[in-house]
Interface confidence: low
């Protein structure tokens, strides 16, 4: 019924993200760029800047129905593949060509920003079809806090907290050490609880990238790596 | 056993509205997509409307494009075509059907019996 709950897809602010729209139809029209056309709208979350709204350029689309207040048009495609969206045409959203011809208008950010955070509305129009895709897109912080912070010295301890800013809680949690991404498991060295990793004593063998990924139950994971700084023996 | 019963069609008035029920039991509808189709006499069976099983996915033949709407109802377990500016070319007989498929594009699993509908003045 209406106040239905739309689905969520959670992005990790920075990260690409992909806001499905899909037929999935292997017979879908060759010719579709040339008779049919897509818009995407966002109506950003409330206590978001609102974007100026574009000039809407796709004759021949289907009007949908009044934008509610904040709404306005990410991007469309007219028939003929003519582009139009907010002024300027921000470069981080992105409709594949080659998607479109196989009946895939999902729509990607590249990266996703904070301010992308809202409900998305797609209206895809086809010679004899009407496809309507609607979802909320929620952008989460990712951050890998270190206590204490700074420069470690050789024997000090440290514990490392890896947070993304989403209220349910991750259904697992991998640590990984250095630019080869080396699986980081509980030992003398290392002790992991959930989101925490605890180094006792730590030494220079230690310094360089400590990393977690935080995988969610919709499949969402985010990657969150650290800096770790320890002096040597000088 | 799934059954899908229509229900709502009737004798209608062009330019007059009907809303068809689609009553499901033996399964739980919101975890299917649900489609209308139609078969008028002497022409091949159509997808009218469809609901992905989210809800946030509807698809139409643009012949019943902005006249006709598909919902779904999860705490009746009951879909709906709301048919509005009924058309003579509208008439048919209805069915609703039921696929796990992600999209409608793959084959529906249950059928109903269909209902009649008939626009005429």
């Known amino acids: 019924g209406p106040g239905k709950e739309l689905p969520v897809v959670w992005a990790q602010e920075g990260a690409p993200v992909h806001l499905p729209c899909s037929l999935k139809s292997p017979n879908l029209d060759p010719n579709f760029l040339r008779r049919g056309g897509v818009i995407w709208q966002h109506q950003p979350d409330s206590g978001q800047p609102t974007p100026i709204p574009a000039l809407d350029l796709h004759q021949g689309m289907p009007s949908p129905r009044q934008p509610a207040p904040g709404r306005y048009t990410v991007l469309s495609v007219a028939p003929g593949g003519l582009r139009s969206g907010r002024q300027p045409l921000h470069p981080h959203v992105q409709l594949e060509e080659r998607g479109l011809q196989r009946g895939d208008f999902s729509l990607w950010l590249r990266p996703a920003l904070r301010t992308d955070a809202g409900e998305y509305h797609a209206t895809v129009r086809l010679p004899n079809r009407a496809l309507s895709c609607s979802l909320r897109l929620r952008v989460g912080q990712a951050s890998m806090i270190a206590s204490p912070s700074g420069v470690l010295k050789l024997s000090d301890w440290v514990l490392l907290n890896c947070s993304f800013s989403r209220p349910d809680r991750p259904v697992s949690v991998h640590w990984f050490q250095g630019q080869n991404r080396v699986p980081v498991y509980n030992s003398p060295r290392h002790f992991l609880a959930e989101t925490f990793l605890l180094l006792p004593q730590v030494s220079p063998l230690d310094s360089g990238t400590w990393g977690c990924v935080l995988t969610y139950r919709d499949g969402f994971n985010v990657s969150i790596t650290y800096n770790l700084k320890v002096l040597g023996l000088e | 056993q799934v059954q899908l019963v229509e229900s709502g069609g009737g004798v209608v008035q062009p330019g007059g509205s009907l809303r068809l029920s689609c009553a499901a039991s033996?399964?739980?509808?919101?975890?299917?997509?649900m489609g209308w189709f139609r078969q008028a006499p002497g022409k091949e069976r159509e997808l009218v409307a469809a609901?992905?099983?989210?809800?946030?996915?509807?698809d139409y033949a643009d012949s019943v494009y902005g006249r006709f709407t598909i919902s779904r109802d999860d705490s009746k377990n009951t879909g709906y075509l709301q048919m509005n500016s009924l058309r003579a070319e509208d008439t048919a007989v209805y069915y609703c059907?039921?696929?796990?498929?992600?999209?409608?594009?793959?084959?529906?699993?249950?059928w109903g019996q269909g209902t009649l509908v008939t626009v005429s003045s």
């Open positions: 059907a039921a696929t796990h498929y992600y999209t409608h594009r793959g084959p529906f699993d249950y």
């Open positions: 033996g399964l739980t509808l919101s975890q299917y997509t």
């Open positions: 609901i992905h099983w989210t809800s946030s996915v509807t």
